[in-house]
C-alpha cells in the first residue's frame, strides 16, 4: 500500500480512527470538586470536563471562576485555512479579546513563535515517520484503555471551535502507555484536508493521509492541564490516520452526521455518548511513539505522541462530509487544518513492532539504524 515499509497490516493499513485538537485545556475538575447533592451538575453541566483546551486550543490557561480548578478547552487559539494546502505555514495572528485569549490561524502572519515562543522549539510536532529508521522497542507494550465505552447519557459536547471539531470527553476515560504511565482522556479532535487534498498532520515517508484523529490525555500525575504543559510526559496524544475505505464507519457516523448542526464557527451541539475506542484502530499493540509538542499554539513540548500503525477506514462520503461541512473564521471553510511536519532534530521515533523489517522487494537489506532508548526497561 501507500506506506511501503510497514509490516503486516500493510502500511498503516486498515481500519480505525484518531485524534486532533490537542488538549482541551483543562476542564478537569479536581477530585474534591464533587457536586452538591442539592443541585449537582446537569447533563450538560459537567464540572471541568466540558471545556478542555484543544490541542490547538491551548491558550494561556486560566481556571474558570465558576468551576474552581478547571480550564476550558476553548481557551485556545482559533484556526483558519492555510494558504498552502499541502504544507500549511507555521504562522498565526493574535488578537486581544477578553482575557488575553490568543487567536491564530493556519498560514498567516505573524509567525506562530510570536504567538507562543514554544512554537519555535526544537522538538515540535507533527513529524514525518520513517518506519525504516524507527527503533524497535519491545518494551512498548499494547496500550490499555479503560472506560472508553461511554453510555449514551450523559451527552457529550461536540464543538466547532474554528480550527477543528472537538468532542469533549467526560472524566473516567483511563489510558496507560505502560506500567506507571497513566493518563486521563480530555478531548478528541480531527485534522483534515480538502477535496482531493489530504490533511493528516503526521506523514509516513512523506505520505499524507486524508485525515487524522487525536485523543488528548493528561497524565494522572497532574490535576490540571496548565501544570502539565511543557512537562515531559505531562500530556499524551493518541493519533490515528483516517483513510478511505469501501464502507461507512458507523462509529464516526455518530459524529459526522451532526456536523451540519455546528457548521458555523463557535457553534456546538450535544451528542449521545459513544464507544470512543471504536474511533481508534483495533490494534493497540503496533504503534510509533516519540516526544513532541502540541501541533497548535501554545506548541508546548513534552507531549508523548503515539501514532497507530493501523489506520481507520471511513467511506469517501464520510471523508467529504468531514472536509466540506464546517466553517472557520472570516467566512472561510474550515479545511486543511494541519501543521507542516517539523524536523526531528535528533529525536528517535520508537516502534512497538519491527517496523524497519520490510518484506517488500524494495528493501534488499532492511537495517534498523536506531536502537531502542527503553531497551533496558
Amino acid at each position: 500500500q501507500r506506506l511501503p515499509r510497514m509490516q503486516e497490516d500493510s502500511p498503516l493499513g486498515g481500519g480505525s480512527s484518531g485524534e486532533d485538537d490537542p488538549l482541551g485545556e483543562e476542564d478537569l475538575p479536581s477530585e474534591e470538586d464533587s457536586p452538591r447533592e442539592e443541585d449537582p451538575p446537569g447533563e450538560e453541566d459537567l464540572p471541568g470536563e466540558e471545556d478542555l483546551p484543544g490541542e490547538e486550543d491551548l491558550p494561556e490557561v486560566k481556571p474558570k471562576s465558576e468551576e474552581e480548578g478547571s480550564l476550558k478547552l476553548e481557551d485556545l487559539p482559533t484556526v483558519e485555512a492555510p494558504g498552502d494546502p499541502q504544507e500549511p505555514q507555521n504562522n498565526a495572528h493574535r488578537d486581544k479579546e477578553g482575557d488575553d485569549q490568543s487567536h491564530w490561524r493556519y498560514g498567516g502572519d505573524p509567525p506562530w513563535p510570536r504567538v507562543s515562543p514554544a512554537c519555535a522549539g526544537r522538538f515540535q510536532s507533527p513529524v514525518d515517520i520513517r518506519p525504516q529508521l524507527a527503533a524497535f522497542c519491545p518494551a512498548l507494550r499494547p496500550l490499555e484503555l479503560l472506560g472508553f465505552q461511554l453510555p449514551p447519557l450523559p451527552e457529550l459536547r461536540l464543538r466547532n471551535n474554528g480550527h477543528s471539531v472537538q468532542l469533549t470527553l467526560p472524566p473516567g476515560l483511563e489510558m496507560a502507555l505502560g506500567p506507571g504511565r497513566e493518563y486521563r482522556a480530555l478531548q478528541l479532535h480531527l485534522h483534515w484536508g480538502a477535496a482531493g487534498r489530504p490533511g493528516s498532520e503526521h506523514t509516513v515517508e512523506g505520505h499524507r493521509f486524508p485525515a487524522e484523529i487525536h485523543v488528548v490525555h493528561l497524565s494522572t500525575a497532574f490535576a490540571r492541564v496548565d501544570e502539565a504543559l511543557g512537562r515531559p510526559g505531562g500530556l499524551a496524544v493518541l493519533a490515528a490516520f483516517l483513510e478511505e475505505g469501501p464502507e461507512e464507519n458507523s462509529a464516526y457516523e455518530q459524529l459526522l452526521s451532526r456536523l451540519e448542526e455546528i457548521a458555523e464557527e463557535g457553534s456546538e451541539t450535544q451528542v449521545p455518548g459513544l464507544d470512543i475506542s471504536a474511533l481508534l484502530p483495533s490494534d493497540f499493540s503496533r504503534y510509533f511513539q516519540y516526544e513532541g509538542s502540541l501541533t497548535t499554539p501554545p506548541c508546548a513540548q513534552g507531549v508523548i505522541w503515539t501514532v497507530f500503525n493501523q489506520t481507520v477506514m471511513l467511506s469517501a462520503k464520510q471523508l467529504h462530509t468531514l472536509s466540506d461541512t464546517l466553517w472557520g473564521p472570516g467566512d472561510s471553510r474550515l479545511q486543511l487544518n494541519f501543521r507542516a511536519t517539523q524536523p526531528l532534530n535528533g529525536r528517535v521515533i520508537e516502534a512497538s513492532f519491527p517496523a524497519g523489517v520490510d518484506s517488500s522487494p524494495r528493501a534488499a537489506e532492511p537495517v534498523q539504524l536506531n536502537s531502542c532508548l527503553a531497551a533496558g526497561d
Epitope: 475538575p29 464533587s34 457536586p35 447533592e37 443541585d39 449537582p40 451538575p41 446537569g42 447533563e43 450538560e44 453541566d45 459537567l46 464540572p47 470536563e49 479503560l146 472506560g147 472508553f148 465505552q149 453510555p151 449514551p152 447519557l153 450523559p154 451527552e155 470527553l169 467526560p170 472524566p171 473516567g172 476515560l173 483511563e174 450535544q270 449521545p272 464507544d275
Partner: antibody
Framework: QVQLVQSGGGLVQPGGSLRLSCAAS????????MSWVRQAPGKGLEWVSA????????YYADSVKGRFTISRDNSKNTLYLQMNSLRAEDTAVYYC??????????????WGQGTLVTVSS | QSVLTPPSVSGAPGQRVTISCTGS?????????VHWYQQLPGTAPKLLIY???NRPSGVPDRFSGSKSGTSASLAITGLQAEDEADYYC????????????FGGGTKLTVL
Amino acid sequence: QVQLVQSGGGLVQPGGSLRLSCAASGFTFSSYAMSWVRQAPGKGLEWVSAISGSGGSTYYADSVKGRFTISRDNSKNTLYLQMNSLRAEDTAVYYCARNGNYRGSLAFDIWGQGTLVTVSS
Amino acid sequence: QSVLTPPSVSGAPGQRVTISCTGSSSNIGAGYDVHWYQQLPGTAPKLLIYGNNNRPSGVPDRFSGSKSGTSASLAITGLQAEDEADYYCQSYDSSLSAWVVFGGGTKLTVL
C-alpha cells in the same frame, strides 16, 4: 427545594394506555437528563427509559420499546411517560428520577415519590 | 441480572457490614462507575454513593463505597437500626440495549 412530584398512576386494563407526569422544581430542568425507573411489587429496581436535557435523544429498555414514549416539556418543567399496550407485567411503582451528572457518570440523584400503575382485568 | 448482589445481609448495631456488587467485563469491569442507593421501607430510593466512592452531602460517613476490577462494594460501619433497608448498586452495561443496570437488591437487617 429540589423536588419531583409525580401524578397519573392508576388501574388500567391490559392493552390500555396511561400517561404519567413528573413535575420538577428547584433546579434548571432543561440542564438535566431524566429517567423513569420502575419497581414491581416485592421486586428490585428496573430502568425503563431516559431522555436527554433537550429532549432530543430518548432511550428505552427492550421490555418497553415500541410501547412506551418518554417526553418532556422544558417550558413546563415536566417529564412524561406515555404507556400504551400495557401488560400485566408492567404493574409496578414508577419513579421519575433526575440524572445528576457526577464526573461524567449519570446517577439518579433526585427521585419522585413514585406512582403505582396496576395493569389488571 | 448482569450485576449481582446478595439477597440479604445482617448485622448487629455497631457492627460493620459490606454488600458486594459483582459484575463483568461489559459493565463494572469496563470502567463504568458504580452508584449505590438506599430504599427505606415504603419510600423512594435515595442516592447513597455516586462514582464508586463519593457521598452526596447529607449522607453519613459511616457509608463508603469502593470498586476493584469487576466488582464493587458498599461498607456500612457503626450499624444503626435506621440503616435497615434495601440497597441497590447501579452501573452501565455495554452489552445491553438497556444500558442502565441495577443489582437485584440486598435487604439489610439490623439484628
